[in-house]
Amino acid sequence: EICGPGIDIRNDYQQLKRLENCTVIEGYLHILLISKAEDYRSYRFPKLTVITEYLLLFRVAGLESLGDLFPNLTVIRGWKLFYNYALVIFEMTNLKDIGLYNLRNITRGAIRIEKNADLCYLSTVDWSLILDAVSNNYIVGNKPPKECGDLCPGTMEEKPMCEKTTINNEYNYRCWTTNRCQKMCPSTCGKRACTENNECCHPECLGSCSAPDNDTACVACRHYYYAGVCVPACPPNTYRFEGWRCVDRDFCANILSAESSDSEGFVIHDGECMQECPSGFIRNGSQSMYCIPCEGPCPKVCEEEKKTKTIDSVTSAQMLQGCTIFKGNLLINIRRGNNIASELENFMGLIEVVTGYVKIRHSHALVSLSFLKNLRLILGEEQLEGNYSFYVLDNQNLQQLWDWDHRNLTIKAGKMYFAFNPKLCVSEIYRMEEVTGTKGRQSKGDINTRNNGERASCESDVLHFTSTTTSKNRIIITWHRYRPPDYRDLISFTVYYKEAPFKNVTEYDGQDACGSNSWNMVDVDLPPNKDVEPGILLHGLKPWTQYAVYVKAVTLTMVENDHIRGAKSEILYIRTNASVPSIPLDVLSASNSSSQLIVKWNPPSLPNGNLSYYIVRWQRQPQDGYLYRHNYCSKDKIPIRKYADGTIDIEEVTENPKTEVCGGEKGPCCACPKTEAEKQAEKEEAEYRKVFENFLHNSIFVPRPE
C-alpha cells in the first residue's frame, strides 16, 4: 500500500504501527523525539521498500539499529530533501549501527549522520555504491572509528564473507553490521541493479528485483511505475506524480492537498500532476487543472486591510513578497537598515501596479527607488490631501528615482509632490513628469527647485574612457582628465566596479545610504602632472568574468547657491582574460572489465573560460604489497570500546607525542599552528552546523494541536 503524503512519528513509539501496510511512503518519514527508551524488537516493517522523499531520525531513545525496523528498505528517492539531505540521522543516542542492509540507492540528495554518540559501522559502508556523489555527505561527531572495532561478517574466523572496495585509498570489506554485508552487483551489470543471486535486473529497475531482466519484477523503478511495470515515461493519458509513478487525470483532480484544504487542487502541466503551476505559469481559470504561461511575472493580488501599507522595515516588506498588484496605498518610511536596497527589491521587486497612492517620506536609508523595479502603474484611485498620488518628502540621501532610460511608469490620476530631498536633482523629477504623463498636472509649489538637489552635483558632464587593458585577473583603465570650470573644485575620482554577467546593471543597484553597496569602490587621486590621464589598475579579479565599471569625479558640491557641475562615465562592460580552469570535481574511476577503466568527473567549479576538452592521463602502478602483510582482523587489533559523547571534538591524542625530525632537529613535535585558511574553514564548518541544527529544530518542533 502507498502511504503518505509524509509520515511523522513522534513522542510515542507505538505510532510506528502506522507503517504496518506501507510498501511505499509517498513523501517523507520522520521518526523523532521518542524520549523513553523502548524495546523495538517487536516492530518490523518488511513491506516498506521505498521512501520517495527523505528519512529523518532524531532523538529516538533505545533504538539500536534500523535493520530490524526496515529490513527491505531499498530506495530513498530524495524527490524532496531535508536541507539537501535524503537521509538524516541526528542525535540518536543509542543507535549502534545503521543496519539498512537492503538500502541500495539514494537517488537524489546526500546523507547527514551527526552527533550519534554510539554509532559505529560508518566507515564500513561504501556510500558511493548508494549515492551518485559522496562529496556532500556529512558524517561527523559519531563514535570514533578507532573505538568501534567494526568487524564485517567472517573476518574474525578468517573467512570474510563481504566484498571489498576502496574508500580514501583504503581497500576494505564493506558491511552494514557484524552479520550483514553490503550488497554489490557484478561489474557486468554496470549501472543496473541485481537480484540476491547476482543476476542483472531490467534497466528500468532501481535498487533490486525479484527476477532478472523483467520490468515487472523491480523492487523500485528507475523512472516511473505504472500498472505494475517500471516504464521510462508515463503512457498516454497518465501523468508523472511525486517523481515516481504515473496517475490518471481523475486521480490528479481529486488529490486533497496536504498543505491546505482551501487550495485549488492539483494541476496537470508538462505531463506532470503537481500541486500548483510552476514558476512563470498560472491556472487557465480558477477551476482549471491546466497552466498557461504568464505574460511577465505571474499576477498575485495583495490587499491591505487598513488601505495603507507602511513599509518601515524589511519585515513589513516581506509581507509583499511575490505581489504584482497591490490594492491600496504604499507608505515607505525606511530610516535605517542593513542591505536594505537589495532586501526591498527581493520583497517588493515584483509589484507592477499600486491602485492607490505612493508616499515616500523620511526614508534616509534610500538612495534610489529602483527596488520597485517592476512598478509600471500607479492608478491613484485614492489620493492624499491635495490630490497627490506620488509624494516624496524629506529623504536625505535619495539620489535617483528610477533609470528612466529603461522604465515606463504611468501615474493615471493625481499629482506629484517633491520637497526636501537634498540629493535629488530637479532634472530627475522633471524627467519623471515626462515619463509618467503628469507634466502639467503639478502646480509651481509641488516641485520645490530650491530644496530638492541642493546638495548634489546635478549638471553632470560625461567622463570618457581612453584605454582598457585586461589580463586574467587585472583590468587597467584610463579616462580623460575632467576639467570643471574651476580646477580647484575637482578633488579626486572614484572608480566603481563589480561582476556583471549581464549588461543590465545600473549605478544604484544594491546601494543604500547605510553603507550597503553591491559596487566595489576605489578612490583615485588626481595625477600631479596635469598632462597625465588618470587611471587605475584593478587587481584580484576573477578570470574570464565580465565586470561593469564606471568612474565619478568627486567635486565640491556647493558654491553658495549655484549648483556646480559634476561628472561621471557611462557604465563600461569589460571581460578579464581566460585562465587555467580549476580541477575537475568528483573524479571517480571503476573497472568494468579486466582491461578497462571507466572514469567519471564533474566539470570544474571555476572553468575560467570556455572549456573545450579534458585531458585524461593514467599510469600503471605497482600493487601495494603492504595491503597483504597485515591481518587487520586479528583480535589484538580491536581497541577497547569507549563511549563517545556525541560532541564534535578535535581528535584526542591518546599516545605520547611521537619523536620525529622537526625543523631539522630531533625531538618531540608540536602540531603546526593552524593557517588562516584552516581557521576560516573551521569557522565556516561550525557556522554550517549551527545553520543545519536551527533548520532541523525549526522544521520539527511544532506547537501541539489544540
Epitope: 500500500e1 502507498i2 523483467n214 515487472t216 505504472y226 500498472a227 505494475g228 511495470v229 503512457p235 497518465t238 506524480f241 509513478r245 504515473c246 496517475v247 490518471d248 487525470r249 481523475d250 486521480f251 483532480a253 481529486n254
Partner: antibody, heavy 122, light 107 residues
Framework: QVQLVESGGGVVRPGGSLRLSCAAS????????MSWVRQAPGKGLEWVST????????YYADSVKGRFTISRDNSKNTLYLQMNSLRAEDTAVYYC???????????????WGQGTTVTVSS | DIQLTQSPSSVSASVGDRVTITCRAS??????LAWYQQKPGKAPRLLIY???GLQSGVPSRFSGSGSGTDFTLTISNLQPEDFATYYC?????????FGQGTRLETK
C-alpha cells in the same frame, strides 16, 4: 486481509430495478478504482462498469449505458451498482472487483468478490 | 472497441505437460494485457498482469509474454489444480474487454 462481499442480487421482472452493494475491507478503499464484472450462465466474463477511487470518473459498457449507475461511498467502504430497466440478457452473476493499482482507473482486477446472482425473468 | 480472440477455445492436457494459450487483440495494446484463471462456481483469479508480470502468490510455472497484438500464457509442468478456464483481458483503453475463454481440461 483484503475482502469484497457482494449483496443485493435476486429475481426481478423485466423493466424492474435492483441495487447491488459490495462491502470492502482490508485495504484503503478510496485509493483504488473498483469495477463490476458479470458472467451470464455458461458464458464468459463481461465488464460492466468502473469507478475511480474518488468517484469522480465512471465508465460503462455500451450494453448498460444509460440504465446502470455505478457509485461508491468511501466513508462506508462500499461500492454500488444501481440497475434500472433490467432486461432478460442482464441475467448473470455480478462480481465486484478491486483494480490492482492505485492512481489510475484502467487496470487489471486483483481481488474479486464471491459474486451475487441477478435473475431477470417474467 | 478492442476485440480479444483466444485460441484454442479448449485444450486437453495431462499433469506435467506444458500448455500454451494465445490471445490476439484487434489492435495494438502495447503490453496492457492480463490473464485470469476461473474454476467452476468461483470468482476469477488474476495470474499475469502487464503481459508478463507474475501476480504475487501465483506459482512460477505460469508465465506470460507478448506485446502489441499477440500474447501467450504458458503453463509449464501442469498440475491437477490448473485445470480451469483461462481468460485474457485488455487494460489499454475503455471499454475493458475479455477474451471468450479457453477451457483447459484433463486428457
Amino acid at each position: 486481509q483484503v475482502q469484497l462481499v457482494e449483496s443485493g442480487g435476486g429475481v426481478v421482472r423485466p423493466g424492474g430495478s435492483l441495487r447491488l452493494s459490495c462491502a470492502a475491507s482490508g485495504f484503503t478503499f478510496s485509493s483504488y478504482a473498483m469495477s463490476w464484472v458479470r458472467q451470464a450462465p455458461g458464458k464468459g466474463l463481461e465488464w460492466v462498469s468502473t469507478i475511480s477511487g474518488s468517484g469522480g470518473s465512471t465508465y460503462y459498457a455500451d450494453s448498460v449505458k444509460g440504465r446502470f449507475t455505478i457509485s461508491r461511498d468511501n466513508s462506508k467502504n462500499t461500492l454500488y451498482l444501481q440497475m434500472n430497466s433490467l432486461r432478460a440478457e442482464d441475467t448473470a452473476v455480478y462480481y465486484c472487483a478491486k483494480e490492482r493499482g492505485s492512481g489510475w482507473s484502467l487496470d487489471n482486477m486483483d481481488v474479486w468478490g464471491q459474486g451475487t446472482t441477478v435473475t431477470v425473468s417474467s | 472497441d478492442i476485440q480479444l480472440t483466444q485460441s484454442p477455445s479448449s485444450v486437453s492436457a495431462s499433469v506435467g505437460d506444458r500448455v500454451t494459450i494465445t490471445c490476439r487483440a484487434s489492435q495494438g495494446i502495447s503490453r496492457w494485457l492480463a490473464w485470469y484463471q476461473q474454476k467452476p462456481g468461483k470468482a476469477p483469479r488474476l495470474l499475469i498482469y502487464a503481459a508478463s508480470g507474475l501476480q504475487s502468490g501465483v506459482p512460477s510455472r505460469f508465465s506470460g509474454s507478448g506485446s502489441g497484438t499477440d500474447f501467450t500464457l504458458t503453463i509449464s509442468n501442469l498440475q491437477p489444480e490448473d485445470f480451469a478456464t483461462y481468460y485474457c483481458q485488455q487494460a489499454s483503453s475503455f471499454p475493458i474487454t475479455f477474451g471468450q475463454g479457453t477451457r483447459l481440461e484433463t486428457k
